[in-house]
Every structure is written in C-alpha cells, then in structure tokens.
Amino acid sequence: QPSVSPGEPSPPSIHPGKSDLIVRVGDEIRLLCTDPGFVKWTFEILDETNENKQNEWITEKAEATNTGKYTCTNKHGLSNSIYVFVRDPAKLFLVDRSLYGKEDNDTLVRCPLTDPEVTNYSLKGCQGKPLPKDLRFIPDPKAGIMIKSVKRAYHRLCLHCSVDQEGKSVLSEKFILKVRPAFKAVPVVSVSKASYLLREGEEFTVTCTIKDVSSSVYSTWKRENSQTKLQEKYNSWHHGDFNYERQATLTISSARVNDSGVFMCYANNTFGSANVTTTLEVVDKGFINIFPMINTTVFVNDGENVDLIVEYEAFPKPEHQQWIYMNRTFTDKWEDYPKSENESNIRYVSELHLTRLKGTEGGTYTFLVSNSDVNAAIAFNVYVNTKPEILTYDRLVNGMLQCVAAGFPEPTIDWYFCPGTEQRCSASVLPVDVQTLNSSGPPFGKLVVQSSIDSSAFKHNGTVECKAYNDVGKTSAYFNFAFKGNNKEQIHPHTLFTP
C-alpha cells in the first residue's frame, strides 16, 4: 500500500493488498476498504458500472461477470484499485460485440479475460480465414485486444478473440469490425447546371451533389455576399461502403429579379472544403437580341451567291423564325439552329442562302424571330451589281443625240466621235445634258442615267459612240451618220456590248 507523509491526505487501503486477485467461480469475493473518509466502492467492466457505499464489498457467489476493476474512493477524491479475475472455464471471455474503428487509429476489441493464466491470447479470423497480413494487435487480458492503425480494408472483417486452454484453442463470440473512414480528400461537389435564366415568377430549383467517404461530410447552400439561411432539401445514398452521396436541392418557388446572383454549394470535412457555384439571372420578361454576322448592307455581283447570317439570343426559346423578301416568306434555302448543344444555350444561328442573284433580286431581306414574349427583326439591304444596259439611243427632233443606260452602281456615260470610217473612237465629246432618272422598279434596282449631246457640232461623216460603264462592265451604242449636201442624215444606230 502507498505510504504518504503525515498531514497530507492519503489514498484508501484495500485488503487483500494486491493489484490482482484471482477467485474461482462460485467462491466469495470479499474486499475491504480502509479509510477514515471512505466514500464508495466502484466496479467497472466493459460498459458496466456499479457502486457500493459499504466499505466492505462482498459477493457471496462470484460469477465470471464479476471480473473487473474494483475502486475505492475517499472524500478527498483519492482512490485505490484491485482487479479481480473470476476464473470460469465455461466463460473465458467477457464480450462487448460492438466494434468500431476509425481509419488510421487504434481500436479495442473488447474481450477481457476471466482467467489471466490462459495462454496465446490473440485474434483469429472467422471460419478459419487468415487475418489481413498487415493487421497488428496488442493483447491486454484486462481490457481486450488493441488493433493498431485500422485500415479501410478491414471494414466488415469478422474475427474472434482466442486463447489456448489445456492445449485447445477457445474462441470468443464473433466481432464484426466497422471502419469509419478518415477523410483523405476534400468532398467532391457538382451542380446540376452552372447557370439559370428565368422569368419572374418561375421556379428556381438547383441540385448540388456532394460525394464523400462518409455521411459526416457537412454541406450547405449559401448565397454569395449574404448570410440568409436558404431552404434546402436532402436526399442521400450509400453506394457501397465508402461511397456516400448527398443531393442538396435549393428551391425558390417564385423567383424575383432581386433573387438574381451567385449561389454557392459549400461542403467540408476534416481534410478541407470544396465549393461550386451556379448563377441565377431573373428577368422581368423574355428577350430577343439579334446580331448580324455580316454587314447589313451587302453588295453582290449579278449571278453570284451570298449568305445572310445572323446570330441571336432568345429567351424563352424561339418559336417562329422566317426570312422575308418583298412580302414573301422563304420556304427554301435557309436553316436555323442552336449555337451550342448545351442545355443552357440561348444563342441561335440563322442562315439564308441567296444563290445566283439576278439584278432584279436586290432589295431588303428581313429576318423575323419571335418567342412567347417578344418579336424581333433585322433587315439586310442587298444591292446586286449589274453591267450597264443601254435602254434607248436616239436622235431627237431637236438634233440632240440621246443615250439612256441602266445598271448598278450608277453607270457613267461617255461620248466619242469617230471621223470617217475609223473603228476606234477616241475624240471625246462633252454632253450637253446628263440626268439620273427615277427608276420605276424597287429602290434597290438598277439606276437609270440619260445623257445627250448636240449633233450639230459634227461637220463630217462619222460615227458617234455612247459608252456606258460601271465597276461591273461596259456597253456601247453607235450612231452612224453622213452628210448629203448640207443635210445630216442619221444612219441606223447599233450597239456593241463589250464585256
């Protein structure tokens, strides 16, 4: 028994004065605690605790379950203990079958012995199966067997405590080890959609999926720059032993414009945290924005092709698209398609293919698109460049020679005089009058120009050339005339078209 100097409180003394006591089953346990300030006896084994206020603890007929630690405590809180083994050949182990181990930590298989003198106290696998090669353990007859550094692979391991008694192996009841995994990575979080676009009053619902090794992962939806608690619902599943999934669904039943913003799904475990965000945009009504992919004023040569291309944003999705020219809707040579296959896509493309355009097909081509909220349109002004065509070439009664040409861009008319029979007309003649006439056709059609010269200026036989030209090409008409005496006589005009 411990000795303490006088004046200081000392722990109680126990009789018998041993740290361990072995009794046979059925025998008496008699323990005496001596202390002027005696308070109580306490008995502990596994999860069981008993108290006794008598200074003498007596158990008349000891049973195996009386095996355990008996502690006497005085009023100063000082105590002394004795461990009693009640030897019962029929019950070598006391057992608490609950067995949980945290990954990488030690865990105790609680199978304390009732007889400390048995040998080879150890663990064995169930049904003769070997234990994992890397499993290490330390036996303690009073507590059980400590498994060192539990591995995830030990989960659901079936085992027995084992001793040798009179040369025979005796097994305890079986234990099933349940391993609580350690967090060795941050949770994996994902969101059903990265962005949402809604109209006022529509429901906003977004689901965050959190994956981790166990259900003790923490998760929550937060609104960025706000402390407001959001309403969320959970569903969860265990897919196998260390594969836990939780779905946290955030819902705003009737979204408002001021609900727009960034929402964060945050998750953390003892290793660290992870988050993912989704953006909500709430608009008061739908919209359509059209972006031309080419200039809205288009110049194209006669007989050539041109493609009119627009991109447009539409929310809600477009319901009707059409291309129109001269109040006629195209049924052919156009297509409309989403810019991407992403389910959040609001951008679309429309193409109109104009092939082998004629000079008469210039004009305004309009793309119209609508959804349930709005209509929108964009116009392309298409000008078809055409080579000049000489419409009329006449000698007027007043002696004027007149040439009228049409084309686009606006033709220029030059006049030349060829004396005698020369083929090349080089001497230019200034016109008396040049006018651009209003075309009766559409505003995008050919432009008509009229030019006149005074034929009285010519004193010799010859040919007059009217040449109309623009960026596309040129065309000529000729006036042949000769003098008979003093009279000027017009000979048939004719044209030569030069490419």
Epitope: M293, I309, F330, T331, K333, W334, E335, Y337, V349, H353
Partner: nanobody, 121 residues
C-alpha cells in the same frame, strides 16, 4: 434530279483514319444543311453529324465527338467526313443526306446509296 454519291469507304484498322466524300448534284448545294447518317450491321440508323449550308454551324453525335470532323466545299459541291481514331463500333454503311430548310436538323429529303466502312484488324 438530286443525286448524292458517297465514296471513300473500305477496310481500316482500329485507331486508323478515313475520309469520306459525298458529291452532290441536281440542287443548289450551298443552300442546304447536310448530314452524315450511318447504319451498323443489324442495327438502326444513327445520325452522325450535320453542317449548315455555309459550314458556319456543325453538330456531332456524342459517340463521334472529338474524333470525326464534318466539312464542305461549296465550290466543288462536295461534303466530307474526316474520321480519326476509328473503333470497331464505327463499322457501318455511311450515308450522305440532304437536309430540308428550316430549323429541324433531323429531317432529310434525299439520301445517297451509302459507302461501307469496316473497322477491323
């Protein structure tokens, strides 16, 4: 008369490449979206890829995304399908198909006779 004539099929090893062509005539080629559609032995038709009239827009089935490339040369009235990293499951008859105007890329009004691509070692 609309005609679509595929070529370029044949036997190719897994991981290999092949380029299919489709020569179009009898319509204004540049005015229409075009598709490639395939049919594996004993299976139904599977849409593979689509390209708009200008080539500005393209779409691919998930099964070929990143491996196949659709293109067109409007000056030659020809549609192409470049197939890389070919797999046994790409074995099929490949058809070229002319799209209809509008906003439904899954509608076709003319088909070619098809060209067989066999992927095997």
């Amino acid at each position: 008369e609309v005609q679509l004539l595929e070529s370029g099929g044949g036997l190719v090893q897994p991981g290999g490449s092949r380029r299919l062509s489709c020569a179009a005539s009898g319509f204004t080629f540049s005015g229409y979206g075009m598709s490639w559609v395939r049919q594996a032995p004993g299976k139904g038709l599977e849409w593979v890829s689509w390209i708009s009239g200008t080539g500005y827009g393209t779409y691919y089935a998930d099964s070929v995304k990143g491996r196949f490339t659709i293109s067109r040369d409007n000056s030659k009235n020809t549609l192409y399908l470049q197939m890389n990293s070919l797999r046994a499951e790409d074995t099929a008859v490949y058809y070229c198909a002319k799209g209809v105007p509008g906003n439904n890329r899954a509608l076709f009004d003319y088909w070619g006779q098809g060209t067989l691509v066999t992927v095997s070692s």
